[in-house]
Interface confidence: low
Amino acid sequence: ARNGDHCPLGPGRCCRLHTVRASLEDLGWADWVLSPREVQVTMCIGACPSQFRAANMHAQIKTSLHRLKPDTVPAPCCVPASYNPMVLIQKTDTGVSLQTYDDLLAKDCHCI
Amino acid sequence: ARNGDHCPLGPGRCCRLHTVRASLEDLGWADWVLSPREVQVTMCIGACPSQFRAANMHAQIKTSLHRLKPDTVPAPCCVPASYNPMVLIQKTDTGVSLQTYDDLLAKDCHCI
């Protein structure tokens, strides 16, 4: 079971999966990607208060040291724990190709 | 080869491995760990400017969207890319035990 899934800041305020719509232009991909024209980018956004979704022992240490030495040690950060694959139709010299990217869309989030 | 190892903010300012000395009391471990009395915690600290040590495609997307929508999308964050194991001598009901933790000390850092 994941450590600390209750967000003390209120529903939806802590580290969780968000969807951000982005065009190929937004991503700087217009010159090499044909499709999709728009990507629903899933990403991990939100605060990581004490022990919320702590990924591992390192995250727990980071929380402790952040409270003691806030000038030196940053708080844990909300990052992907796993990814969903995504297929892009890319432009090539000879036409198009389908390429699967395994590390493009966040699937699940934790604090580290 | 890792993406963007040159720090535009100046030497040592960007995401990299730091060592922070911490006592068992600092970590809240005094009641269950016997040794070591002090831990040299290696952790990832520093800024993640555009494309610096970008871990993957997701990190590159995050950089692009952060520049476009800074109020919505946070900048990439400096987190461990891998860990070094560490052995703790723990107190038990019957005496002591040696326990290896694989996710305690950061070994290498990247931005995600």
Epitope: L9 | A47, D71
Partner: antibody, heavy 119, light 110 residues
């Protein structure tokens, strides 16, 4: 010694513009989140906005009229204020954020510069 | 937007008194709150970060507590140099709520 020195304040007419500067010394501005805070005469502190490593956030009332920027080569932070109103009369402080994890306390402050908006 | 409400707006106390100032957030901000002290004609000075962490060089008579929506700044034994105005500030900005200050509490000599 770490220091912040604001300048650029003065008298301006309603509807006018002003650009405040905050010169940093003893540290590199580019390594820190920075904020602007203002204080009307005899009143409390009011947060204006913050600049992170590559973006800005503003108080609701400041959006659209105020813009925070910085010039890393000059180690200087700026606050561009447009369409000024009499209620913008205040001492404007720049402040350095102590750390930027998920919380942004202000640890180092300048002495402030007074902006008076009056016809 | 988050609103911060401080009380009382002013108080009179004597040297040696225990002084308590409260700050209430309009919605939960966990422990993401700072306290500042300001003297006339001077910029504010940070006292406490993250609700209870004492800033460097701040005397131990100052302490902070609370989490969620209700926070307290306590001065255990008021000293002459503590007569000033105190402000709380929400420091949570992940969702662009801003970093609003409370209205301030002026601590005066009785």
């Amino acid at each position: 010694e770490v220091q912040l020195v604001e300048s650029g304040g003065g008298l301006v007419k309603p509807g006018g513009s002003l650009r405040l500067s905050c010169a940093a010394s003893g540290f590199s501005l580019s390594n820190y989140y920075m904020s602007w805070v203002r204080q009307a005469p005899g009143k409390g502190l009011e947060w204006v906005g913050m600049i992170s490593f590559s973006g800005t956030t503003y108080a609701t009332w400041a959006k659209g009229r105020f813009t925070i920027s910085r010039d890393d080569s000059k180690n200087t932070l700026y606050l561009q204020m447009n369409s000024l109103k009499t209620e913008d009369t205040a001492v404007y402080f720049c402040a350095r954020v102590v750390y930027a994890g998920w919380t942004y306390p202000l640890g180092i402050w300048g002495q402030g510069t007074l902006v008076t908006v009056s016809s | 937007d988050i609103q911060m409400t401080q009380s009382p707006s002013s108080l009179s106390a004597s040297v040696g008194d225990r002084v308590t100032i409260t700050c209430q957030a309009s919605q939960s901000i966990s422990s993401v709150l700072s306290w500042y002290q300001q003297k006339p004609g001077k910029p504010p000075k940070a006292l406490i970060y993250e609700a209870s962490i004492l800033a460097s060089g701040v005397p131990s008579r100052f302490s902070g507590s609370g989490s969620g929506t209700d926070f307290t700044l306590t001065i255990s034994s008021l000293q002459p140099e503590d007569f000033a105005t105190y402000y709380c500030q929400a420091n949570y900005d992940v969702y662009n709520y801003g970093n609003p200050f409370g209205g301030g509490t002026k601590v005066e000599i009785k």
